[in-house]
C-alpha cells in the first residue's frame, strides 16, 4: 500500500498591497526522479479555523523535491483579520489507476498581518489602495475597545458594514465611482457617548477605466518614417503620482520590434530599408491596473500622406487666363500624384483635378479681369488614395481689361433764360464691368443742330456728376468710362431743344414700409424704355438724386430702398425715352414712405380783438416742410361757458380736461374768426395741424380776454 503523499513544510507569506497570501510547500515520499499529477485542496479560514471562507483545488505535476507555489487574493485587507491556511493532496495520475485517497490535512498555518501597532485605539484598512472605477472594494476598521461605538463615512456620508467579530467590521463598497484624482476619503470615528475617542482615515485611489485607444492610424510622407496617431481617451493619471498617465507601446509583429512611445497620442516608427511593405501594428495602452490594445494591418504604399506642394507660382497672367505651377516632394521613382486645385475669387470657388509626375501645371481660364484670386493645391497618391496633403496656396491678380459696359447715365435739365443747365449723373460701374480701376470719364457733348461742333470734358474718377450749360439747341451727350486699358461703350443721352412738358400735374401718392409703388400711362409712340427719378422734396436735388431704368413694356415699378426715411417727402418724375433717346416727362408724383405727425405748431397771431370776437391767423405756417401732408388744423378753445360755440364740439384733452374743438379741413385755410363771445371774458386757444398720422405736438394754450363793450382796440 502506497504512503499518502502529505504536503509538508507549508509556509505562508503575505503581500499587503495585493491583499494576497502566497503558499509554499513540498511533498514527502515522492519517488525519486518521478513525476506525478496531483491535486491539492486548499482551505482558508478567517478569524478562527472553524470559519472556512474559501475552499479550492489546485492541480499540477509534481517532481521530486519540488517546492510548490500558489497564491490567493483576499477581498478583505489582510490587516483586518487573522487568516488560517491548510492543505491536503491526492494523486491523480494514470500511472496509479487504483482508487486514490486524500492525504491528511497539513496543520493550520496562521497568517496575521500586524499593522495595528502603537497606542491608537482604532485602525482603518487598506492603506492607499488603488482600484479601478466600477470595481467592488472591501474596507474594514479594527477597534481595540469593543465598548466604543464606531461610525464610518465615505466622502462625509455614513456607510454601514458587517461585523466580523467584536473588534472588526467590514464594509463592501460596490462599484466605486471616480470622484477626484487625489483619491476618495473614508474615515471612521470611535466614540463613547458623545465623546470622540479618535478618528482614523484612509484614501482610496479610484482610477478611471483605461479606454481602448480610438482612431489608431499610421501613415508615411517619405517612406522613411511612419507617423502613428490615436485618440488616447481619458487620462487615468492620479494625484501624488499614485498612478501616472497611461503609457503607450507600439509593437510590429512581422519585424518583432517594439517601441515605448513618449507622447500620449502619437509615435514615430522608423521604416527600415528592407522592403517591408506590410505592417501589423499593435498599440498597447497600459496603466497600473490593466492593458488595452488595438490592431491595424496595412500596406505601406496604401498609407501615403504627402507633404504639401511647394513653389506655387503663376505664369503668363493676363486679364482672363493664368498658368499655375507647383512642385511636389519626390518620394519614389515613377510615382503618380493626383492633385486638386481650388480657385477662389469673386465669392465663387472652382475645383479642378489633375494627374502629375513631378511638377504640376494647370491652365486657369475664363478669369475675371482685375480680380484677386486665391489658388491653392493639394496632392495625394494617385495609385492608392489615402488622404490629401495640406493645401499650399498663393494669391494672384489678373490684369485689367477695358470696361465692358456703358455707364448708367441720367440728367436733370433746368431751363434758364437763353439756355439749359444740364446736370449729368452716372453710376459707378460694378466691379464686374469696370474690369479695373476707373480713372476718368469722358463726356462728349455734340450739338445736333451744328453737327461739326462737339466738346470733350474729361472728368477724373470718382466724380459721378457734372454740370453743363447749353444753349437752346438739341444736344447728344456721350459718357464713356476709362481705365488704364481702354474705354467703355458710350452711354448716349439726347437733350431736346424743346422745353420739358410743363403741363404735368403732380399727384400725391402714399408709400409703404417697402417703398413706393408707381404706375403710369404708356407714352404714345415708340419708346425704348422709361426712367423714374426721385429726390428728397426739401433738399438740394444734387444731394439725394436717384434714378431707375425700366423696360419699354413696363408701366409700373416698385422703388424700394433703405434710404427712404419716415417723415421725408420724396418727389418722383417719370420719363419716356424715345427711339431718338429724347426724354419726355410723363408724370410727377410726390409722397412719404411713412407720414408722421407734424413736428411743430403754427405761430398764431390774434387780430381784431373785440368784446364779442377775435381773429386767429397763421399765414406764415409752411405746409411744405412737414413730415406728412398737412390735411388741416384743429382749433382748441377753452372758456367758462358750459356750452361750446357754434361749429365747435366738445373734446377731451390728453390731460383729461374738457374743451371745445373746431376742425379746419383745408391746409391753406390759415385764419379763423372766433365770434359769439362775451365781453370781459377769459378764453384760451391752441391750434395744431394734423396729418394722416396725427396732430402736432401738444403745447400750452394762449390766453385772450375780451374787452368791455365800450373799449376800442
Amino acid at each position: 500500500e502506497r504512503l499518502p503523499l502529505t504536503p509538508v513544510s507549508l509556509k505562508v507569506s503575505t503581500n499587503s498591497t495585493r491583499q494576497s497570501l502566497h503558499l509554499q510547500w513540498t511533498v514527502h515520499n515522492l519517488p525519486y526522479h518521478q513525476e506525478l499529477k496531483m491535486v491539492f485542496q486548499i482551505q482558508i479560514s478567517r478569524i478562527e479555523t472553524s470559519n472556512v471562507i474559501w475552499v479550492g483545488n489546485y492541480s499540477t505535476t509534481v517532481k521530486w523535491n519540488q517546492v510548490l507555489h500558489w497564491s490567493w487574493e483576499s477581498e478583505l485587507p489582510l490587516e483586518c483579520a487573522t487568516h488560517f491556511v491548510r492543505i491536503k493532496s491526492l494523486v491523480d495520475d494514470a500511472k496509479f489507476p487504483e482508487p486514490n485517497f486524500w492525504s491528511n490535512w497539513s496543520s493550520w498555518e496562521e497568517v496575521s498581518v500586524q499593522d495595528s501597532t502603537g497606542q491608537d485605539i482604532l485602525f482603518v484598512f487598506p492603506k492607499d489602495k488603488l482600484v479601478e472605477e466600477g470595481t467592488n472594494v472591501t474596507i474594514c476598521y479594527v477597534s481595540r475597545n469593543i465598548q466604543n461605538n464606531v461610525s464610518c463615512y465615505l466622502e462625509g456620508k455614513q456607510i454601514h458594514g458587517e461585523q466580523l467579530d467584536p473588534h472588526v467590521t467590514a464594509f463592501n463598497l460596490n462599484s466605486v465611482p471616480f470622484i477626484r484624482n487625489k483619491g476618495t476619503n473614508i474615515y471612521c470615528e470611535a466614540s463613547q457617548g458623545n465623546v470622540s475617542e479618535g478618528m482614523k482615515g484612509i484614501v482610496l485611489f479610484v482610477s478611471k477605466v483605461l479606454e481602448e485607444p480610438k482612431d489608431f492610424s499610421c501613415e508615411t510622407e517619405d517612406f522613411k518614417t511612419l507617423h502613428c496617431t490615436w485618440d488616447p481617451g481619458t487620462d487615468t493619471a492620479l494625484g501624488w503620482s499614485k498612478q501616472p498617465s497611461q503609457s503607450y507601446t507600439l509593437f510590429e509583429s512581422f519585424s518583432g520590434e517594439k517601441k515605448l512611445c513618449t507622447h500620449k497620442n502619437w509615435c514615430n516608427w522608423q521604416i527600415t530599408q528592407d522592403s517591408q511593405e506590410t505592417y501589423n501594428f499593435t498599440l498597447i495602452a497600459e496603466n497600473y491596473l490593466r492593458k488595452r490594445s488595438v490592431n491595424i494591418l496595412f500596406n505601406l504604399t496604401h498609407r501615403v500622406y504627402l507633404m504639401n506642394p511647394f513653389s506655387v507660382n503663376f505664369e503668363n497672367v493676363n486679364a482672363t487666363n493664368a498658368i499655375m505651377t507647383w512642385k511636389v516632394h519626390s518620394i519614389r521613382n515613377n510615382f503618380t500624384y493626383l492633385c486638386q486645385i481650388e480657385l477662389h475669387g469673386e465669392g465663387k470657388m472652382m475645383q479642378y483635378n489633375v494627374s502629375i509626375k513631378v511638377n504640376g501645371e494647370y491652365f486657369l481660364s475664363e478669369l475675371e479681369p482685375a480680380t484677386e484670386y486665391m489658388a491653392r493645391v493639394r496632392c495625394a497618391d494617385a495609385s492608392h488614395f489615402w488622404k490629401w496633403s495640406e493645401w499650399s496656396g498663393q494669391n494672384f491678380t489678373t490684369l485689367e481689361a477695358a470696361p465692358s459696359e456703358a455707364p448708367d447715365v441720367w440728367r436733370i435739365v433746368s431751363l434758364e433764360p437763353g439756355n439749359h443747365t444740364v446736370t449729368l449723373f452716372w453710376k459707378p460701374l460694378s466691379k464686374l464691368h469696370a474690369n479695373g480701376k476707373i480713372l476718368f470719364y469722358n463726356v462728349v457733348v455734340e450739338n445736333l443742330d451744328k453737327p461739326s461742333s462737339s466738346e470733350l470734358h474729361s472728368i477724373p474718377a470718382p466724380a459721378n456728376s457734372t454740370k453743363l450749360i447749353l444753349d437752346r439747341c438739341s444736344y447728344q451727350i456721350c459718357v464713356i468710362a476709362n481705365n488704364s486699358v481702354g474705354a467703355s461703350p458710350a452711354s448716349v443721352i439726347v437733350i431736346s431743344a424743346d422745353p420739358e412738358n410743363k403741363e404735368v400735374e403732380e399727384e400725391r401718392i402714399a408709400g409703404t414700409e417697402g417703398g413706393f409703388s408707381l404706375s403710369w400711362k404708356p407714352q404714345p409712340g415708340d419708346v425704348i424704355g422709361y426712367v423714374v427719378d426721385w429726390c428728397d422734396h426739401t433738399q438740394d436735388v444734387l444731394g439725394d438724386f436717384q434714378w431707375k431704368n425700366v423696360g419699354p413694356n413696363t408701366t409700373s415699378t416698385v422703388i424700394s430702398t433703405d434710404a427712404f426715411r419716415p417723415g421725408v417727402r420724396y418727389d418722383f418724375r417719370i420719363y419716356g425715352l424715345s427711339t431718338k433717346r429724347i426724354a419726355c416727362l410723363l408724370e410727377k408724383k410726390t409722397g412719404y414712405s411713412q407720414e408722421l405727425a407734424p413736428s411743430d405748431n403754427p405761430h398764431v397771431l390774434v387780430d381784431t380783438l373785440t368784446s364779442h370776437s377775435f381773429t386767429l391767423s397763421w399765414k406764415d405756417y409752411s405746409t411744405e416742410s412737414q413730415p406728412g401732408f398737412i390735411q388741416g388744423y384743429h382749433v382748441y378753445l377753452k372758456s367758462k361757458a358750459r356750452q361750446c360755440h357754434p361749429r365747435f364740439e366738445k373734446a377731451v384733452l390728453s390731460d383729461g380736461s374738457e374743451c371745445c374743438k373746431y376742425k379746419i379741413d383745408n391746409p391753406e385755410e390759415k385764419a379763423l374768426i372766433v365770434d359769439n363771445l362775451k365781453p370781459e371774458s377769459f378764453y384760451e386757444f391752441f391750434i395744431t395741424p394734423f396729418t394722416s398720422a396725427g396732430e402736432g405736438p401738444s403745447a400750452t394754450f394762449t390766453k385772450v380776454t375780451t374787452p368791455d363793450e365800450h373799449s376800442s382796440m
Epitope: D120, F123, V124, D128, G183, Y187, K200, I202, G239, W240
Partner: antibody, heavy 126, light 110 residues
Framework: QVQLVQSGAEVKKPGASVKVSCKAS????????INWVRQATGQGLEWMGW????????DYAQKFQGRVTMTRDISISTAYIELSSLRSEDTAVYYC???????????????????WGQGTTVTVSS | QSVLTQPPSASGTPGQRVTISCSGS????????VSWYQQLPGTAPKLLIY???RRPSGVPDRFSGSKSGTSASLAISGLQSEDEADYFC???????????FGGGTKLTVL
C-alpha cells in the same frame, strides 16, 4: 494633553527667508497630518499647505509653490515651515494645525483641524 | 477675494438664533465636506463643526451645521455674549487641490 507649540515672533527684511517651528506633544506625531495656515491682520485664514509627518509627503497651495518648504524632524516631533523671498504682504500670523483624522495613508485628505498652535507673528519690513 | 463666500457680519441679541451662510461651488462645497471654525479675538481658530454637521467633543450643541448643494450654513441658537467672534467655513477644493476658507463673518451679540 494634546498641543502644538510654535516658535517665537520673527522680523525679517524683504527678500529674506523665515523658518517657523511647531512642536507636537500628547499624541503620536507621525499619525496626524500637519497643516499650515496664515492670517494677515484683520484678514481671513489662508491655507498654505500640508505635510504627512510619517512619509514626509507635502502639498502646497498654488500661490506658495516654489517659495514654501515644509519639513519635519520625527525624533523631536517637530514640523517646520520655511518661506523664502519674503515680501511685505507676507506679514501675518502663521499657525500650524493638526488634521483631526489620524490617517492610515501617506497622502492627504482634509477633514478639519482640531488642534492649533498659538501662532507665530512674522513681520516683513525694510 | 475668498473662494468661499460668507457675509462679512451678522448680529443677534442674547437668546436669539443666528445663521451664517457659506456659498461655494461644485469643486469645493458641492463635492467635499465643510468644517466651521470660531476665532475669538487674539486667539487661534477653534474647530466647531466637521463633516458638515458633526461637533467635536466640548462644543455645545447650540452650534449646528448643515449643507445643501454648494452652500453650507452654521446655526447658533440661544446666542450668548461669549459667542461674539469671527466664524470661518472651510472645505477641500478639487480644482485648487487644497483647503479653501471663507472670508469670515464677524458675529456681534447686541
Amino acid at each position: 494633553q494634546v498641543q502644538l507649540v510654535q516658535s517665537g515672533a520673527e522680523v525679517k527684511k524683504p527678500g529674506a527667508s523665515v523658518k517657523v517651528s511647531c512642536k507636537a506633544s500628547g499624541y503620536t506625531f507621525t499619525s496626524y497630518d500637519i497643516n499650515w495656515v496664515r492670517q494677515a491682520t484683520g484678514q481671513g485664514l489662508e491655507w498654505m499647505g500640508w505635510m504627512n509627518p510619517n512619509s514626509g509627503n507635502t502639498d502646497y497651495a498654488q500661490k506658495f509653490q516654489g517659495r514654501v518648504t515644509m519639513t519635519r524632524d520625527i525624533s523631536i516631533s517637530t514640523a517646520y515651515i520655511e518661506l523664502s523671498s519674503l515680501r511685505s504682504e507676507d506679514t501675518a500670523v502663521y499657525y500650524c494645525a493638526r488634521d483631526m483624522v489620524a490617517a492610515n495613508t501617506d497622502y492627504y485628505f482634509y477633514y478639519g483641524m482640531d488642534v492649533w498652535g498659538q501662532g507665530t507673528t512674522v513681520t516683513v519690513s525694510s | 477675494q475668498s473662494v468661499l463666500t460668507q457675509p462679512p457680519s451678522a448680529s443677534g441679541t442674547p437668546g436669539q438664533r443666528v445663521t451664517i451662510s457659506c456659498s461655494g461651488s461644485s469643486s469645493n462645497v458641492g463635492s467635499n465636506t465643510v468644517s466651521w471654525y470660531q476665532q475669538l479675538p487674539g486667539t487661534a481658530p477653534k474647530l466647531l463643526i466637521y463633516t458638515n454637521n458633526r461637533r467635536p467633543s466640548g462644543v455645545p450643541d447650540r452650534f449646528s451645521g448643515s449643507k445643501s448643494g454648494t452652500s453650507a450654513s452654521l446655526a447658533i441658537s440661544g446666542l450668548q455674549s461669549e459667542d461674539e467672534a469671527d466664524y470661518f467655513c472651510a472645505a477641500l477644493d478639487d480644482s485648487l487641490n487644497g483647503v479653501v476658507f471663507g472670508g469670515g463673518t464677524k458675529l456681534t451679540v447686541l
